[in-house]
Interface confidence: medium
């Protein structure tokens, strides 16, 4: 803590301006009124204070607002935001998207810090759900944001927000997250025509059930192998060779390169070798001709 000392004669700050960069820490503490600082926070960002000097300014605000800063101050924190701890931020009530954007801008280009994570958490909880504008903003700054949420948190995302999601926003999502997002995406894009619908839904297909994949196979979508490899194994296994051929279109030839990897490997093991041979790709490992295929899934469900 900075010790209390009297302000030297003639040094009392009448406004927040560049002259303050010449003030020692103790002079800032003694000569800058906290209320003046709070009303002129927007100026702080334009002044090249040292980090030590910023420590003093933060200390003054902390003394003025021990219960947490008001939004009028938070919105203009600028680089002073980098000085805040998650504990500081938990005291805030941030409701304005403009405030959120202003603070995210300060951290732009860096990994999501604990401070930013806390800020976003406070903001989203205050709003009650991840609306489209918020999601737009968060994914613009942090493309991986959506995939950092738990399936429970994702359940609060309204289908209308899905329009804001870009393919790269889902790169790090795991199957449990896509299970939650896919039905929302399906609802969001339901009124689009076939080819447009596929373009939009493609990134979410890691959460699609078998029946939806069967339906897509009837629409000449030409799914690429990268998308196919991200599908749920349990959704791919029941597809017939003909359905996979229709689903992939000209990309079907890529199955050969992926025959040792899931879900292709597991799918091959479920197909008749005769059927696989019709693809002319030399895929091996199917059920030999003359073998009886039993569907044990019903028996397992009953036992």
């Amino acid at each position: 803590e900075v010790e209390k000392t009297a302000c030297p004669s003639g040094k009392k700050a009448r406004e927040i301006d560049e002259s303050l960069i010449f003030y020692k820490k103790w002079e800032l503490e003694a000569c800058v009124d906290a209320a003046l600082l709070a009303t002129q926070m927007d100026r702080v960002n334009a002044i090249p204070f040292t980090y030590e000097q910023l420590d003093v300014l933060k200390h003054k605000l902390d003394e003025l607002y021990p219960q947490g800063y008001p939004e009028s101050v938070i919105q203009h924190l600028g680089y002073l935001f980098l000085k805040m701890s998650p504990e500081d931020i938990r005291k805030w009530n941030v409701t304005s998207l403009e405030t959120l954007k202003a603070l995210l801008e300060v951290n732009k280009g860096h990994e999501m810090s604990p401070q930013v994570a806390t800020l976003i958490d406070r903001f989203v909880k205050g709003r009650g759900q991840l609306d489209k504008d918020t999601l737009d903003t968060l994914t613009a700054f942090y493309p991986g944001y959506l995939c950092s949420l738990s399936p429970e948190e994702l359940s609060s995302v309204p289908p209308s927000s899905i329009w804001a999601v870009r393919p790269q926003d889902l790169d790090t999502c795991d199957p449990r997250q896509l299970d939650v997002l896919y039905p929302k995406a399906r609802l969001a894009f339901q009124n689009m025509n076939g080819s447009e619908y596929f373009v939009k839904i493609q990134s979410f297909l890691g959460g699609a059930p078998t029946e939806d994949l069967k339906a897509l196979s009837q629409q000449n979508v030409s799914m690429d192998l990268a998308t196919f490899m991200k599908l749920r194994t349990d959704a791919v296994l029941p597809l017939t060779v003909a359905e996979v051929q229709k689903l992939l279109g000209p990309h079907v030839e890529g199955l050969k390169a992926e025959e040792r990897h899931r879900p292709v490997r597991d799918w091959i093991l479920r197909q008749r070798q005769d059927d696989l041979d019709t693809l002319g790709l030399g895929l091996q490992g199917g059920i030999p001709n003359g073998y009886l295929v039993l569907d044990l899934s019903m028996q397992e469900a009953l036992s």
């Epitope: 002259s19 010449f22 020692k24 820490k25 090249p48 040292t50 980090y51 030590e52 980098l82």
Partner: antibody, heavy 120, light 107 residues
Framework: QVQLQQSGPGLVKPSQTLSLTCAIS??????????WGWIRQSPGRGLEWLGR?????????DYAVSVKSRITINPDTSKNQFSLQLNSVTPEDTAVYYC??????????WGQGTLVTVSS | DIQMTQSPSSLSASVGDRVTITCRAS??????LAWYQQKPGKAPKLLIY???TLQSGVPSRFSGSGSGTDFTLTISSLQPEDFATYYC?????????FGQGTKVEIK
């Protein structure tokens, strides 16, 4: 493009005053966004920041603790330059002295440097 | 004062090499760090400030990283004009201080 041109003697006797001048082109010594500083470099002490001045509705300065009692930096607005005076020099003050423009504490433009030797 | 320690103090490298210089602060300085390049008989030149922001006009082969106490200057592919001495400088504190320098020589 900002340029800084240094001038001053290269030899000073012990106990005397070292005086150097830095002429600015491409910016103003009275700029409210920059400050103007002096730095020195010697084999023994490496790079050492000495002090700075800047105009912020009035002239302001601050100096490194190590030289605070001996240093003065002054502006000359009519010639758009600033000067360094270091009193009571000793051989320890032998160094290459640089002037520089400071944005905050980042030194983005430097003078060419002046080797000052303190010797009798 | 905050002490800045650079390593190595010198290194030998060839044109095209990737070169890494580290700078450690004696206490946390957030990202208040600058890097300078100095050639013999010349003044230092600002390369990077804010730990990672490239100064205007500096080639993109130079990059900086780090925060807190540990920082790195990287030259992705060393060029003939890059043989010089490199200094880090902290400006977290009012008393700015520099590292002792790292000399990059031709192997």
């Amino acid at each position: 493009q900002v340029q800084l041109q240094q001038s001053g003697p290269g030899l000073v006797k012990p106990s005397q005053t070292l005086s150097l001048t830095c002429a600015i082109s491409g910016d103003s010594v009275s700029s409210r966004s920059a400050a103007w500083g002096w730095i020195r470099q010697s084999p023994g002490r490496g790079l050492e920041w000495l002090g700075r001045i800047g105009y912020r509705s009035k002239w302001m300065n601050d100096y490194a603790v190590s030289v605070k009692s001996r240093i003065t930096i002054n502006p000359d607005t009519s010639k758009n330059q600033f000067s360094l005076q270091l009193n009571s020099v000793t051989p320890e003050d032998t160094a290459v002295y640089y002037c520089a423009r400071m944005q905050g504490f980042q030194l983005d433009y430097w003078g060419q440097g002046t080797l000052v030797t303190v010797s009798s | 004062d905050i002490q800045m320690t650079q390593s190595p103090s010198s290194l030998s490298a060839s044109v095209g090499d990737r070169v890494t210089i580290t700078c450690r602060a004696s206490q946390t300085i957030s990202s208040a760090l600058a890097w300078y390049q100095q050639k013999p008989g010349k003044a230092p030149k600002l390369l990077i400030y804010g730990a990672s922001t490239l100064q205007s006009g500096v080639p993109s082969r130079f990059s900086g990283s780090g925060s807190g106490t540990d920082f790195t200057l990287t030259i992705s592919s060393l060029q003939p004009e890059d043989f010089a001495t490199y200094y880090c400088q902290q400006y977290y504190s009012y008393s700015v201080t520099f590292g002792q320098g790292t000399k990059v020589e031709i192997k």
